[in-house]
Each structure stands twice: as structure tokens, then as C-alpha cells.
């Protein structure tokens, strides 16, 4: 007996379409081996209408595909515009058409209800507007115009000229007449119901001369797009409703077990706890379409998802979706990285971010979330080098360790740093992930001094202070500029033996500038790492001012007092929207920290690591 | 609250039929999937036929056991299926119940892609 299954019998009606699920047993063979639907002929030949690796015969063309689903071991053969020469009997199966591992399906399509001659089809999702077109001879203009709705053997009037509408269509249709010579009236439904499926007649005039036109109106529920997304992923939902509702109230809900949807993000504000930092809808086009973004994907985000427009934000009958069936991928491509990371305050975090490995050139991004209405994500940094003005000195995106993940680092935390931050590129953007930064009690352990003065043509000497664990570790001193930290070159005064046995009084790297310069002015940055894994930073800023002469006075560059806690968003802030996440240059403009100068020389900055057992000693 | 009710069960000789049907009350909207297991005694639940609709077609699911034998029909409308049981044998005896989806994710011969069910109707075949 043959390990796939499916529907032994489909049935449908002409130009409606079928989704065909077929499932395998998902070994890792099953799973990346071809799959096919194929027709018998005949000559008991089994010919590939369209397979996973891309084929779709010419008959199928433009109205069928195939979708693998490894993970649930399914794939799915979708055929749209039916005709009654579909009939007949089908396989679907794995690997070639000609051996046993397949299933057959009979496909049955009908003819439909028989419509009286002449009836015009409309075929239209739940929600939508439908535009019922209703001719009419010359001599039938003054007259009464009318829809009917066909029940049984009876015709229930809907709308006329003379103002009368049927209580179940009120406030959602009207008849329209056009001017003279213009010999076709119209009637406009909106919010289509499931309910107003049916046959409809128009009738102009009465009596014997009376014109009738019959009208087939096909109510559909949308069927939901399978959208399969990686653990830890992320999802966008492009939700495009028409103009008709581009004013209302948006929203995205998922479908609970008793069939009702539980909103997960409305443009009114509201937003499901689950989805916290992880959710951004984003603002909406002319034509009302939006989109819904959703990173650190979670099985339990699996489920049927719906958009849709109604002024209360949330799911009403009658008002337009679009519908999707997520299912999350365990066997996700996207490495794990922690999703929460703590940092003290006045402290650091080091966090890694995955990226497609795929695309080590693209961009690379980190954003802030911010949860007020909507979501947002105004950027903070960006490989290119830019940082948002007030995390100047603190905040720097490396490509360590490259190969699919680089690393943002964010010092001198304060309680205002704990949040949701998302690490995103201007590539795939389902590699899009969210971590969460929290501030926990405790001391920073890396200690430098505060904001450092130094004089011109004078040798300046910066002590960090580290803690035993840290004595395997490498330490090293660098200048931060807005296009990241330039580690300063070490001096090499000894053994690297010299923190083997570690003193708790003074373990320490040291950074010389000697002679100070102007260009030394600017932030440096004090770290330990393991290869290209970056551990805890602490920073400095080191003010440069002429040697005193008598009446002079020092004034402390704004940068260096800059109130710990200052942290604004301006609204010139770039934002995550569809289209920049394509193309970043598309985000809006933005003042760009200028770059604080030249790299102090080689020869001039030097770096000591020194213990009380042994002065010098490696800057590992 | 949501119930089906299945009917038709009984007694019957060996290459008789049966009808068996299924109704769904306490829903405010249709069933995307309706389907029948059936249990022997001692035995596990195992997946009989399964009837699923969307749109405007229907999609029917049989196991290699019954195919040929049995046929499943029904109404998403009514939120009723029935179940037209043929040549019976000794191996159809069991209480078949009758399982209910609002969707039809899952594979349809796993209790799990199945949220309401019946309590159940025994059907025997004697020799």
C-alpha cells in the first residue's frame, strides 16, 4: 500500500478552483524529493501536469502550482478556472511518475446549477462590492427599475427607483440611473454577506414589454493563503482590502477554536500581549492596503490569520478579509540567538544578531520597537556607519563574526535602554528577529574612569579594571566613531602568563595616548572578547583642551555631560516600512553624526595590560 | 454549546448495508470537515472516511479498508454528513463516532485535526 494519501474523490463545479492536499510519511527523503500531479491517460500513462521543481505543463499554465509543505509531510495542488475538461482521473505522488509511491484522485467537475439563458455570473470574496449591471429598452426609461431576489419559486424585492430597500440589504446597496441615453441602470452592493448569494433579476418597466435581466450573484469566503514561515522567523501579511475601505479601521485578528478571531493588532490602538515587541502594522497606502509585520515567530503563532476594515477594529460580517493559514517551521534555518538579553546599569550588552547567511553583503540594520499605536521602529544603527545622534559613543554594529550573524553593541545602559530591539537587513526579510534587552540590578564589570580631560602635547593614560573571569579573555581599547570601534594597537610587555594567577587589587588594560592630539578628542571604548565574540564594554570620553594658562577656563564638551538618561526620538526618525526595508535609501532623511576624526595613530596610542604580579603582560 | 449526534447504528448480517448519520447543532458557523472513526473492542480509534468543503467543492477522504465499500456525503449548509455502508464484514464491528472541524488543517485520518465529537454509535456484524 502506497505511503501517500489523499482525497480519493473531488468534486467542484466550472470556474470555481481546488486546493488538492496530498501527504507523505515526512522522512528526510520524502521531504526533498520531487512531488508531482499528474494525469492517467489512456495508454495508463500518468502525464506531469506540475511538479515542486517548477514544471507546469501549458494546459495548467497561469492556473495552478504546487506547494510543498516538508515539515507536515503535505503538499498542495492548487487549480484555479475549472472546466469540465479537468475531469477525469489524477495522481499525486513522490519522486517518478511511473513508481508506486502516489495516490489516486478522481476529479469530477459539474456544469453548476442550471441559470436561466443569458444570466451573467459575479463572482465576489465575502466583504466586497459588487456592481449588478442592468439594461433596459428606450421606451422602459421613465418606468420603475427593480432588483428581485430569487427564493425558491418566489422573487422578493430588493431595492427599486421609488426608494424602497429591503431591511437585510440597508445602508449597503443603491440603484443608480444614468442620464438620458444611457440605457443600463446599475445596483451596487456593498459588504457582500454569505447570505446574499443567489440569482437576482433585474426588471425595468412591467407587463409584457418589461425588461429582465437575470444575474448570478457567487458569494465566497476567502480561501486562506498557506504562508510557511521558519521558527524564529518572520511573517508579513499584506493586506490588501480596496478602496471602498480605505478610511476604516484596519485590523488583524487569528482565528481562535470557537471560530471567533481574537484581534492580535488593530489601528486603533489595540495590540494582543503575545505579540508584544514582536509586531509592527505598518501605515497604510492610498489605497487603504497595509501590511502587519510579525518577527521571533513561535509555533504557537500558528493559526488562521484574518485582516480586515470595520470601524470597530475588529471582525464584523459583511466587511471585506483576506485570509491566511501560518504554519511555523521547527526546522528553521535561523540559528537560535537569545531572545532576552540582561544588562546593568551603566553597563553593556553585546547582542548577536542572525542574518541569511546567503547575503553578507547586505545592509545590516537594528531598530528600536516602539509600541505607541501602530508600532514603529525608528533605526539606531546601521552597518553603513550611521547612529542615531543621542547613542553616540554608546552604540556600534559590527560585522563579527560574519558568516550569518553580526553583533550590535549598546554601553552606558541606563533603565530608559530595557526594551524590544529588532535586528533586520535590507535582504530577506524573513530573517528579520526581535530581542529584548533588560536592565537587572547590579555593577558594571568593566571600570573606567569618568569623562577624562587631557592636555595637548601631554601623554594621557586611561585605566580599565577587570575582573578575574575575565582573565582568559581578550582585552582590547578602541576609538568609536560612528563607523564603528577601530581597536588601538597593543604593546606586548610580557608573558601572557600574567593573569594566570589573578590578583583581585589590579588587573587592568591601560590605554596611553602619547602625545595627545586634537584629533584623540572622542570616545573609546574599553572590551574584552573571545575570538570574534564580544563580551562587555565600558566607555570614555576623553575631552582635549590647551595646556592652562593663567585666567583660562575648560569647558566640558556637551557630549561628554550629556545627561545619561537623554534619549529622544525625533520624528525625522527612519521607520521600518515595506518599501525602505527593500531599498533603506528609501527611508526618510536624517541628521548623520559626523564622523569625531581622524584614528588616533599607531604610534601614539598604545595599550598596557598589567597585573601587581608582573607589569606589562599580553593585551590578552 | 456544540453536540453531534450520530444515528443509524445496529445489527446487521455480513454483506449487508447500513446508513449512519451525523448532525452538528450549537454552531454559528459551517463545518469545514466532518468525518467517521470507528473502534473495535480493544482496538484503537481508527480514521473510516472524511467529507471536507471548501468554496464550492468537496473533497472526500476514505480508508484503504472501506474504499469502494463505503461512501461519505453531506451537507456543510446543514452541518450534516451521512455514511452509506456496504458489503459489511466482520472487521466493520465498532462504535463509530462522528468528529467535527471548523477547518481542515491537519492530516483528516488524525483524531488531532478533529475538535467536536460524537459519543458514538455501535454498529455489529454478525456472521
Known amino acids: 500500500k502506497s505511503p501517500v494519501f489523499g482525497p480519493q474523490e473531488v468534486s467542484s463545479v466550472e470556474g470555481n478552483s481546488v486546493s488538492i492536499k496530498c501527504y507523505y510519511p515526512p522522512t528526510s527523503v520524502n521531504r526533498h524529493t520531487r512531488k508531482y500531479w499528474c494525469r492517467k491517460g489512456a495508454s495508463g500513462r500518468c502525464i506531469t501536469l506540475v511538479s515542486s521543481e517548477g514544471y507546469v505543463s501549458s494546459n495548467y499554465a497561469g492556473r495552478a502550482n504546487l506547494t510543498n509543505f516538508p515539515e507536515n509531510g503535505t503538499f498542495v495542488v492548487n487549480i484555479a478556472q475549472l472546466s469540465r475538461d479537468d475531469s477525469g482521473h489524477y495522481k499525486c505522488g513522490l519522486g517518478i511518475n511511473s513508481r508506486g509511491l502516489s495516490f489516486d484522485v478522481s476529479l469530477e467537475v459539474s456544469q453548476g446549477p442550471e441559470l436561466p439563458n443569458g444570466t451573467e455570473v459575479y463572482t465576489v470574496d465575502v466583504g466586497r462590492t459588487v456592481t449588478i449591471k442592468c439594461p433596459f429598452k428606450t421606451e422602459n426609461a421613465p418606468k420603475t427599475k427593480a432588483l428581485y431576489k430569487k427564493i425558491g419559486q418566489t422573487s422578493v424585492l430588493v431595492i427599486d427607483s421609488r426608494n424602497y430597500v429591503n431591511p437585510n440589504y440597508k445602508d449597503r446597496i443603491r440603484l443608480r440611473i444614468p442620464g438620458t441615453g444611457q440605457l443600463i441602470f446599475t445596483v451596487v452592493i456593498d459588504r457582500l454577506r454569505l447570505s446574499d448569494h443567489g440569482l437576482y433579476l433585474c426588471q425595468a418597466g412591467d407587463g409584457s414589454n418589461r425588461d429582465e435581466k437575470n444575474a448570478d450573484l457567487q458569494v465566497l469566503e476567502p480561501e486562506p493563503e498557506l504562508v510557511y514561515e521558519d521558527l524564529r522567523g518572520s511573517v508579513t501579511f499584506h493586506c490588501a482590502l480596496g478602496l471602498e475601505v480605505a478610511n476604516v479601521a484596519k485590523f488583524l485578528c487569528r482565528v481562535n477554536s470557537r471560530e471567533t478571531c481574537d484581534v492580535v493588532i488593530n489601528t486603533l490602538g489595540k495590540r494582543d500581549s503575545a505579540f508584544e515587541g514582536r509586531i509592527l502594522l505598518n501605515p497604510q497606502d492610498k489605497d487603504g492596503s497595509f501590511s502587519v509585520v510579525i518577527t521571533g515567530l513561535r509555533k504557537e503563532d500558528e493559526g488562521r490569520y484574518l485582516c480586515g476594515a470595520h470601524s470597530d477594529g475588529q471582525l464584523q460580517e459583511g466587511w471585506p478579509i483576506q485570509a491566511w493559514q501560518l504554519f511555523v517551521n521547527e526546522e528553521s534555518t535561523i540559528p537560535r540567538s537569545p531572545t532576552v538579553v540582561k544588562g546593568v546599569a551603566g553597563g553593556s550588552v553585546a547582542v548577536l544578531c542572525p542574518y541569511n547567511p546567503k547575503e553578507s553583503q547586505s545592509l545590516k540594520y537594528w531598530c528600536l520597537w516602539e509600541g505607541a499605536q501602530n508600532g514603529r521602529c525608528p533605526l539606531l544603527v546601521e552597518s553603513q556607519g550611521l547612529v542615531q545622534e543621542q547613542y553616540e559613543g554608546r552604540l556600534s554594529l559590527l560585522q563579527e563574526p560574519g558568516n550569518g550573524t553580526f553583533t550590535v553593541i549598546l554601553n552606558q545602559l541606563t533603565t530608559q535602554d530595557a526594551g524590544f530591539y529588532w535586528c533586520l537587513t535590507n535582504g530577506d526579510t524573513r530573517w528579520r528577529t526581535t530581542v529584548e534587552i533588560k536592565i537587572i540590578e547590579g555593577e558594571p564589570n568593566l571600570k573606567v574612569p569618568g569623562n577624562v580631560t587631557a592636555v595637548l602635547g601631554e601623554t594621557l593614560n586611561i585605566p580599565c579594571h577587570f575582573p578575574c573571569k575575565f582573565s582568559s579573555y581578550e582585552k582590547y581599547w578602541c576609538k568609536w566613531s560612528n563607523t564603528g570601534c577601530q581597536t588601538l594597537p597593543s604593546q606586548d610587555e610580557g608573558p601572557s602568563e600574567a593573569f594566570v594567577n589573578c590578583d583581585e587589587n589590579s588587573r587592568l588594560v591601560s590605554l596611553t595616548l602619547n602625545p595627545v592630539t586634537r584629533a584623540d578628542e572622542g570616545w573609546y571604548w574599553c572590551g574584552v572578547k573571545q575570538g570574534h565574540f564580544y563580551g562587555e564594554t565600558a566607555a570614555v570620553y576623553v575631552a582635549v583642551e590647551e595646556k592652562k594658562v593663567a585666567g583660562s577656563r575648560y569647558v566640558s564638551p556637551a557630549k561628554a555631560d550629556a545627561a545619561p538618561d537623554e534619549k529622544v526620538l525625533d520624528s525625522g526618525v527612519r521607520e521600518i516600512e515595506n518599501k525602505a526595508i527593500q531599498d533603506p535609501r528609501l527611508f526618510a532623511e536624517e541628521k548623520v553624526v559626523a564622523d569625531t576624526g581622524d584614528q588616533a595613530g599607531g604610534s601614539r596610542a598604545s595599550v598596557d595590560s598589567s597585573s601587581s604580579e608582573e607589569q606589562g603582560g599580553s593585551s590578552k | 454549546e456544540v453536540q453531534l449526534v450520530e444515528s443509524g447504528g445496529g445489527v446487521v448480517q455480513a454483506e449487508d448495508s447500513l446508513r449512519l448519520s451525523c448532525a452538528a447543532s450549537g454552531l454559528s458557523f459551517s463545518l469545514s470537515r466532518m468525518g467517521w472513526f470507528r473502534q473495535a473492542p480493544g482496538k484503537e480509534r481508527e480514521f473510516v472516511a472524511t467529507?471536507?468543503?471548501?468554496?464550492?467543492?468537496?473533497?472526500?477522504y476514505y480508508d484503504d479498508s472501506v474504499k469502494g465499500r463505503f461512501a461519505v456525503s453531506g451537507d456543510n449548509t446543514k452541518n450534516t454528513m451521512n455514511l452509506q455502508m456496504k458489503g459489511l464484514n466482520l472487521e466493520d464491528t465498532g462504535v463509530y463516532y462522528c468528529?467535527?472541524?471548523?477547518?481542515?488543517?491537519?492530516?483528516?485520518?488524525?483524531?488531532?485535526?478533529?475538535?467536536?465529537w460524537g459519543q458514538g454509535t455501535q454498529v455489529t456484524v454478525s456472521s
Open positions: 468528529a467535527a472541524n471548523p477547518n481542515n488543517y491537519g492530516d483528516p485520518r488524525t483524531p488531532g485535526a478533529y475538535q467536536y
Open positions: 467529507i471536507e468543503w471548501s468554496g464550492r467543492s468537496t473533497y472526500k
